[in-house]
Interface confidence: medium
């Protein structure tokens, strides 16, 4: 049975600033015909037929659900892209993470401006801070890492706060063992 394709993002963030670029790639096993990809944005078929969909100089209208399909294979699971205009944007490698998988958080400044005194918060409590900007790496996510995250920081000497982001860590499905 052919596998469902999977949409991946490069850079890996599904929350980006207006004007930024992101490439969506339709990955799957044994898809030899690279020009036979269908892309759907908010349910509408896109003109793009390559296995990669480039979003250049993102606009608010680029927000929404993206799916891809190779030949007769099932559509991929949807990926949701959000385009923002703000001073700070908290980005996550994924908003729903399987337990044991890595999770990366990034406090991203508008126009890639430097952000100083970056503080990451989880459920209203300071999680970690640096005087310069750093990403947060959680190597093995646990259910306890679920929560509402946001970051604060200084841009051009003024203090700003990102919109909150909900992260959910779900338990990995248990393997079934049968008695022989």
């Amino acid at each position: 049975v052919p596998q469902k394709p999977k949409v991946s993002l490069n850079p890996p963030w599904n929350r980006i600033f207006k004007g930024e670029n992101v490439t969506l790639t339709c990955n799957g096993n044994n898809f030899f015909e690279v020009s036979s990809t269908k892309w759907f944005h908010n349910g509408s078929l896109s003109e793009e037929t390559n296995s990669s969909l480039n979003i250049v100089n993102a606009k608010f209208e680029d927000s929404g659900e993206y799916k891809c399909q190779h030949q007769q294979v099932n559509e991929s699971e949807p990926v949701y892209l959000e385009v923002f205009s703000d001073w700070l944007l908290l980005q996550a490698s994924a908003e729903v993470v399987m337990e044991g998988q890595p999770l990366f958080l990034r406090c991203h400044g508008w126009r890639n401006w430097d952000v100083y005194k970056v503080i990451y918060y989880k459920d209203g409590e300071a999680l970690k801070y640096w005087y310069e900007n750093h990403n947060i790496s959680i190597t093995n996510a646990t259910v306890e890492d679920s929560g509402t995250y946001y970051c604060t920081g200084k841009v051009w000497q003024l203090d700003y706060e990102s919109e909150p982001l909900n992260i959910t860590v779900i338990k990995a499905p248990r393997e079934k063992y049968w008695l022989q």
């Epitope: 005194k117 801070y129 640096w130 005087y131």
Partner: antibody, heavy 119, light 110 residues
């Protein structure tokens, strides 16, 4: 009241090991970096290194890298500074200090631990 | 990572003003606003007097002020008082979560 309480004075011989402590009170210990500062007799302050007790992220001054180990036990709100083999030149007062991201400085200091190493 | 440069000693009479300089590089003092000043009386722990170049923590008299120009920060104490006699250290963030202190300045109130 926010305070850092350091362990008592130590007298040691060259080659011995030592671990001194700094316990935080009155604030969320895991959420602030703790720095260590050396002051040799009659000399100035030297920044040694710093630890974030929440995840044990640690940074060292190049001058102290490999000479000391900074660690923390967040379950008892305590940071540590340790030596595996002391030298006479380690004789000094050692201070721990709490970093404050809102002031960009060390706002709370321990009273210091005097370490005396005889050869 | 060299120590910041401070004068070894300064002195002044009660009521006068004194200024202590602290010279670093563009990698520390010149590169960040995170410059602090600490006061240390003999046998005591250092005490924060100025942070973020020029801000005073609550409880610190407004006779203490800080400034910065390029790679040099300054601490000015006006209306000098006997209890101001102490050692003063500047400190700067130096990037990647490292700090550097100055060599210290002994202030004598004549």
């Amino acid at each position: 009241e926010v305070q850092l309480v350091q362990s008592g004075a130590e007298v040691k011989k060259s080659g011995e090991s030592l671990k001194i402590s700094c316990k935080g009170f009155g604030y969320r210990f895991t959420s602030y970096w703790i720095g260590w500062v050396r002051q040799m007799p009659g000399k100035g302050l030297e920044w040694m290194g710093i630890i974030y007790p929440g995840d044990s992220d640690t940074r060292y001054s190049p001058s102290f890298q490999g000479q000391v180990t900074i660690s923390a036990d967040k379950s008892i709100s305590t940071a540590y500074l340790q030596w595996s083999s002391l030298k006479a030149s380690d004789t000094a007062m050692y201070y721990c200090a709490k970093d404050n991201p809102f002031t960009g400085s060390f706002d709370i200091w321990g009273l210091g631990t005097m370490v005396t190493v005889s050869s | 990572q060299s120590a910041l440069t401070q004068p070894r000693s300064v002195s002044g009479s009660p009521g006068q003003s004194v200024t202590i300089s602290c010279t670093g590089t563009s990698n520390d003092v010149g590169g960040y606003t995170y410059v602090s000043w600490y006061q240390q009386h003999p046998g005591k722990a250092p005490k924060l007097m100025i942070y973020d170049v020029s801000k005073r923590p609550s409880g610190v008299p407004d006779r203490f002020s800080g400034s910065k120009s390029g790679n040099t920060a300054s601490l000015t104490i006006s209306g000098l008082q006997a209890e101001d006699e102490a050692d003063y250290y500047c400190s700067s963030y130096a990037g990647s979560y490292t700090w550097v202190f100055g060599g210290g300045t002994k202030l004598t109130v004549l």
